[in-house]
């Protein structure tokens, strides 16, 4: 069956670059000050190709001595970006990714931004703020999410194959109606996973099968009318 027989079911996506942030506005800073400092580490899923802004603890910049961002990415030496208020100087060590920058001048805004998040940005990000009252830090386990490419086709009579290619994390595939299914996962070196579900329907009154792919980036469904059983000419329903 040719590819043009596939019916894609998904909401139209907005391809403008989205931006995500866990930063809080000034009102929240005073309300949640102690709570935020207690929540030192945050797991944060971020969709690939979006912009991300990571925040330091909500400490007034006037109380600051040094801000340091420590960035630990897989397979790379630890990168640090530091700002010393007294001398108004910034220093970088082992930082090669030009997409990871201060949001603006660090004396005005201590936040870190990642422009156009890539799989390579998976890792741990920590802001350490040195003040006269002690050191405060906030860490992020950044999990980059990759939307899988979804395809559906028939490879044999009354057998359909649904693939969620190169998703991160692995997608989950379900079917309507349920069939006799086998699912395989293929892991790629970049951290993405391809999930392949092959199903067979023996019941002859099944006309159309729907593959539903669930993923943290959103859900997609595809459907296809099954080919007839070879040799079957007529049936009453």
């Amino acid at each position: 069956q040719p590819n043009n027989s596939l019916m894609l079911q998904t909401s139209k996506e907005n391809h403008a670059l989205a931006s995500s942030s866990l930063c809080m506005d000034e009102k929240q800073i005073t309300q949640n000050y102690s709570k935020v400092l207690a929540e030192v580490n945050t797991s944060w899923p971020v969709k690939m190709a979006t912009n991300a802004v990571l925040c330091c603890p909500p400490i007034a910049l006037r109380n600051l001595i040094i801000i340091t961002w420590e960035i630990i990415l897989r397979g790379q030496p630890s990168c640090t970006k530091a700002y010393k208020k007294e001398t108004n100087e910034t220093k970088e060590t082992n930082c090669t990714d030009e997409r990871i920058t201060w949001v603006s001048r660090p004396d005005q805004n201590s936040d870190l931004q990642i422009r156009t998040v890539a799989i390579t940005h998976d890792g741990y990000y920590r802001c350490i703020m040195v003040t006269p009252d002690g050191n405060f830090h906030r860490g992020y386990h950044l999990q980059v999410l990759v939307t899988p490419e979804v395809t559906l086709f028939q490879n044999r009579n009354r057998t359909a194959v649904c693939k969620a290619v190169a998703g991160k994390p692995a997608a989950h595939i379900s079917w309507i109606p349920e069939g006799d299914c086998a699912t395989k996962q293929e892991y790629w070196s970049n951290g993405t996973v391809t999930v392949k579900s092959t199903c067979h329907w023996e019941v002859h009154n099944v006309s159309t099968v729907t593959c539903h792919v669930s993923h943290l980036t959103g859900n997609k469904s595809l459907y296809i009318e099954l080919l007839p059983v070879p040799g079957a000419k007529k049936s009453a329903k």
Partner: antibody, heavy 114, light 107 residues
Framework: QVQLVQSGAEVKKPGASVKVSCKAS????????MHWVRQAPGQGLEWMGN????????NYDEKFQGRVTMTADTSTSTVYMELSSLRSEDTAVYYC???????WGRGTLVTVSS | DIQMTQSPSSLSVSVGDRVTITCQAS??????LHWFQQKPGKAPKLLIS???NLEDGVPSRFSGSGSGTDFTFTISSLQPEDIATYYC?????????FGQGTKLEIK
């Protein structure tokens, strides 16, 4: 863009037969099921059956079993629906549809009247 | 056969109203479906395919949701041109079956 062009309106006597045609273009004719649906005046929609032109495989709804015949001519990309032993309650608009029900013809009015 | 129970069968509406139509598949059997709009003398027009996918050129005030056996079709703010009859169609099992239709009438 898939296009389904149906034959014109028909007036038939009770007991007669009618054959409605539906010519498809814009897609691979032999790769998609073609369905027939009818609608009596002021009534809802009723599925009659389907045919797979690539193999001639057919499914008929039990209600029409023995009275309906669906065929396909792959040389002209045309499907046919023939309904025999017509009665007044077969007066309806008959639609062909394909691409899992997403493309419809404009319909053919069949009037059965003595 | 799968029966599609569509409700309500008719609805008196005003321009600007939010309209909700439901379809439920019998026997607790999960299915997939389309939603159609039909105006007098015209063929049904596909609005929502596969339960929730808005067809190209269809205004965004139309939406579909649901999965399994229970589905909902919504018009967020009714316009005069939306006065029509609406049908659901399950296409998972043969025979394909339609809901009995919901006719919208102006109050």
């Amino acid at each position: 863009q898939v296009q389904l062009v149906q034959s014109g309106a028909e007036v038939k006597k009770p007991g007669a037969s009618v054959k409605v045609s539906c010519k498809a273009s814009g897609h691979t004719f032999t790769s998609y099921w073609m369905h027939w649906v009818r609608q009596a005046p002021g009534q809802g929609l009723e599925w009659m059956g389907n045919i797979y032109p690539g193999s001639g495989s057919i499914n008929y709804d039990e209600k029409f079993q023995g009275r309906v015949t669906m065929t396909a001519d792959t040389s002209t990309s045309t499907v046919y629906m023939e309904l025999s032993s017509l009665r007044s309650e077969d007066t309806a608009v008959y639609y062909c549809l394909t691409m899992t029900g997403t493309s419809w013809g404009r319909g053919t009015l069949v009037t059965v009247s003595s | 056969d799968i029966q599609m129970t569509q409700s309500p069968s008719s609805l008196s509406v005003s321009v600007g109203d939010r309209v909700t139509i439901t379809c439920q598949a019998s026997q607790g059997t999960p299915i997939n479906l389309h939603w159609f709009q039909q105006k007098p003398g015209k063929a049904p027009k596909l609005l929502i395919s596969g339960a929730s996918n808005l067809e190209d050129g269809v205004p965004s005030r139309f939406s579909g949701s649901g999965s399994g056996t229970d589905f909902t079709f919504t018009i967020s703010s009714l316009q005069p041109e939306d006065i029509a009859t609406y049908y659901c169609l399950q296409f998972t099992y043969i025979p394909w079956t339609f809901g009995q239709g919901t006719k919208l009438e102006i109050k």
